[in-house]
Amino acid sequence: MMTGTIETTGNISAKKGGSVILQCHLSSTMAQVTQVNWEQHDHSLLAIRNAELGWHIYPAFKDRVAPGPGLGLTLQSLTMNDTGEYFCTYHTYPDGTYRGRIFLEVLESSVAEHSARFQIP
């Protein structure tokens, strides 16, 4: 039975040209996290963090995606095209798969603020 919950940073905004941390957190379960996949709005892969093999960053993003902190991902040199949904998929044992969603809005405005609060989607 899957008892866990994915908490995410929810809806966040950040400045064009800046960076943002995409973070998910699995709680309320003792399941072991074996792999976390990060995907973009069109379900294209950004990165994988395997507990035993380490990180795989999709080659086209390697110059602007930094692993971490933790199981999260730092997206750098943001463009307006980065606006959209991001998904974290947690493969766990023995529970199975959990999925979280984050919506990122990239703003031209200098008043853009990166909200770091966690919320349950």
């Epitope: 395997n50 080659p59 110059d63």
Partner: antibody, heavy 119, light 107 residues
């Protein structure tokens, strides 16, 4: 065109070390992780480890951890695999293989380097 | 370590007929499975990754299926150039491991 060109065949004595090179071309070397895999005569393929050419960070198969070192030279786009304390069971073809776009599989392979360990 | 087994060890199929190779994995690897083709004296060549995605340039007579612990590689219409050994590999944990291989010949 992606190419991985490996160094030539080696004959080594038991207890010695061998260092195999793999020169990459046709792509941005630091954007793709590199794996090393070996194949003993008539045996299945055996994964040895992987390296991130950008950071130099590596992960190894526990079986080889104390004997294998994988390194890169970013300037020459070359990966290296050094195996120490050689024994006859290390006689095999050693391959470098580029990691694929979408995970930890390998999408391009070198031609292989035959390492023979014999007294 | 994750243990990979393949069946059959070898098979002979008539030209134009279907060839099916199975790969069983000792634990759930979701869809993180690759298939490689190795011809005598050559390096392995990637055919399929993520269980069912065909690698670039691979003819569409090859297809992969399965998830969890049971996977299949199918050659829908065997050609002479398909004579080779086929290996499955999980790409999910350390160490990455390969199956023992299935030798495909022409009947």
């Amino acid at each position: 065109e992606v190419q991985l060109v490996q160094s030539g065949a080696e004959v080594k004595k038991p207890g010695a070390s061998v260092k195999v090179s793999c020169k990459a071309s046709g792509y941005t070397f630091t954007n793709y992780y590199m794996h090393w895999v070996r194949q003993a005569p008539g045996q299945r393929l055996e994964w040895m480890g992987r390296i991130d050419p950008d950071s130099g960070g590596s992960k190894y198969n526990e079986k080889f951890k104390s004997r294998v070192t994988i390194t890169v030279d970013k300037l020459s786009s070359t990966a290296y695999m050094e195996l120490s304390s050689l024994r006859s069971e290390d006689t095999a073809v050693y391959y470098c293989a580029r990691e694929g776009h979408y995970g930890f599989y390998s999408d391009y392979w070198g031609q292989g380097t035959t390492v023979t360990v014999s007294s | 370590d994750i243990v990979m087994t393949q069946s059959p060890d070898s098979l002979a199929v008539s030209l134009g007929e279907r060839a099916t190779i199975n790969c069983r994995v000792s634990e759930n690897i979701y869809s993180y499975l690759a298939w490689y083709q190795q011809k005598p004296g050559q390096s392995p060549k990637l055919l399929v990754y993520n269980a069912k995605t065909l690698a670039e340039g691979v003819p569409d007579r090859f297809s992969g299926s399965g998830s969890g612990t049971d996977f299949t590689l199918t050659i829908s219409s065997l050609q002479a150039e398909d004579v080779a050994v086929y290996y499955c590999q999980h790409h999910y944990g350390n160490p990455l491991t390969f199956g023992p291989g299935t030798k495909v010949d022409i009947k």
